[in-house]
Amino acid sequence: GDMLIQKTIKKEVVLEEGTIAFKNWVKTGTEIYRQFWIFDVQNPQEVMMNSSNIQVKQRGPYTYRVRFLAKENITQDPKDNTVSFLQPNGAIFEPSLSVGTEADNFTVLNLAVAAASHIYPNPFVQVVLNSLINKSKSSMFQVRTLRELLWGYTDPFLSLVPYPVSTRVGMFYPYNNTADGVYKVFNGKDSISKVAIIDTYKGKRNLSYWESYCDMINGTDAASFPPFVEKSQVLQFFSSDICRSIYAVFESDVNLKGIPVYRFVLPSKAFASPVQNPDNHCFCTEKIISKNCTSYGVLDISKCKEGKPVYISLPHFLYASPDVSETIDGLNPNEEEHRTYLDIEPITGFTLQFAKRLQVNLLVKPSNKIQVLKRLKRNYIVPILWLNETGTIGDEKAKMFRSQVTGKIN
């Protein structure tokens, strides 16, 4: 009975040629979609001239099929029972699942202007940058197509910079034809309790972005977890999108296409300030924007983005402190729509359904040397877009799962 099932599970979840887990791990059988909502700025002039609140209107979804490419450079290392790989990036636009086309226009923050003024606070450099910003007729805001905003465009201001800088800018530039990794994960051969847990990322056990334990690469990549998941567990996983490890806790039992799964959610505690949750002290990297580490719900990942002032949050600043969103009008945080969850089949540890939601924001600060930022009287963490990456086990796979796994248990 149970012993036989345990033995079978232990055999089949190992990440090596010939197992059920390996086949699905190399190339996911689940269709994964990434939906984007863009925050279209309604009052760019008032913000720039009067430092008004930014009025945004979300437009979306614009949907892309993602993670359809098989893992590359898969290399087993029998010495330490690990398997290493690259996860190639690719995105295909899905017009039928979108409200418009990739040519739709949006008024958004000028990414290059906001980033350059942050990266180069030196007044002399800012005066130089200001002359180039003016010469290129750039402003605090810009109009860009969806394709440009997401995947990249040649910035007119950066094109005038007479130094070796990348002139291409985009929220996810570069993306297609790139890969995430190298990941090196335990294959579970020596200990099934370690299967899929990341040993190293990009050749290191740490990220070099954070102080202390915040810098650790913990858990799996969230696509699966070691088998025999308990409701009491705190599931750790690493997300390269947010440049950190994070965790999920059990919320409820869910029936997914006849398969009993555990719904694990990212708790608000994970986004709390160090005042509320001292464990988060090492995710607070500066004192001014964070109001001496009392702000919560936003994560400064500039160190992971070549110094660009990128802040990650949940969509619509869900679970964020009021000071973060007080400069933005038009946001409606909603737990059901905007939180992240993982539906995990507890016997195998496989994530059969998930919704990963996050928002990408950019900090823009007043600068008395950059004309287009001169009239600002306060800092803004400006929402650019939010995304919902989802995957659900297909009907055929679910049927197979019911007969092979849950059916046998019941």
């Epitope: 030196n122 002399f124 450099v125 005066v127 130094y163 004309q371 001169k374």
Partner: antibody, heavy 119, light 107 residues
């Protein structure tokens, strides 16, 4: 006290080149932006070139026509101005100036070195 | 390009008198105006930097005011040691531009 000492000035003919140097006594020289400013015989002050602390970013007014190149060697605590294709209107007293801590332009000046371009 | 118009070109004042020099800019430069003094045979010296800020060690008889396009530099009680050329400099935008200078002499 900040000390900046310029050298390299002299009398040259039109079309010739000259390299000016400015030596600093400051330990913190590598953390300061620097400029060259000139004073013409008509008593006009003009910015010639500027460079940021690590030498990565330079600025030249369009009027300088890219005939001048500013550079620095932080290990030697020295600022340079390479001048080529000199014209009679380049005749001036050339000062090196250090920017202030908070970005103030030309907070401290050297004594200057005289460049005379004459046939 | 922001042009800076400085006036007067020269000024002859008696000791103890109040000296006023004016600079007008062609564009709004907020308070990014600086004032320099150059005595004969010496390099220029920064007296007042952006934001009408008196530099450390500069006597309090020197002051400045102004915002936007109109700026005034004042010496409250002129001393003989104040005989010099005075220049304003706008540091708001490139190219940085100096005023043409004011020659202050003793009456």
């Amino acid at each position: 006290e900040v000390q900046l000492v310029e050298s390299g000035g002299g009398v040259v003919q039109p079309g010739e080149s000259l390299k000016l140097s400015c030596e600093s006594n400051e330990y913190e020289f590598p953390s300061h932006d620097m400029s060259w400013v000139r004073k013409t015989p008509e008593r006009r002050l003009e910015l010639v070139a500027a460079i940021n602390s690590d030498g990565a970013i330079t600025y030249y007014p369009d009027t300088m026509e890219r005939r001048f190149i500013i550079s620095r060697d932080n290990t030697k605590k020295t600022l340079y101005l390479q001048m080529s294709s000199l014209k009679s209107e380049d005749t001036a007293m050339y000062y090196c100036a250090r920017h202030g801590q908070t970005g103030t332009w030309f907070a401290y000046w050297g004594q200057g070195t005289l460049v005379t371009v004459s046939a | 390009e922001t042009t800076v118009t400085q006036s007067p070109a020269s000024l002859s004042m008696a000791i103890g008198e109040k000296v006023t020099i004016r600079c007008i800019t062609s564009t709004d430069i907020d308070d990014d105006m600086n004032w320099y003094q150059q005595k004969p045979g010496e390099p220029p010296k920064l007296l007042i930097s952006e934001g009408n800020t008196l530099r450390p060690g500069v006597p309090s008889r020197f002051s400045s005011s102004g915002y936007g396009t109109d700026f005034v530099f004042t010496i409250e009680n002129m001393l003989s040691e104040d005989v010099a050329d005075y220049y304003c400099l706008q540091s708001d935008n490139l190219p940085l531009t100096f005023g043409a200078g004011t020659k202050l002499e003793l009456k």
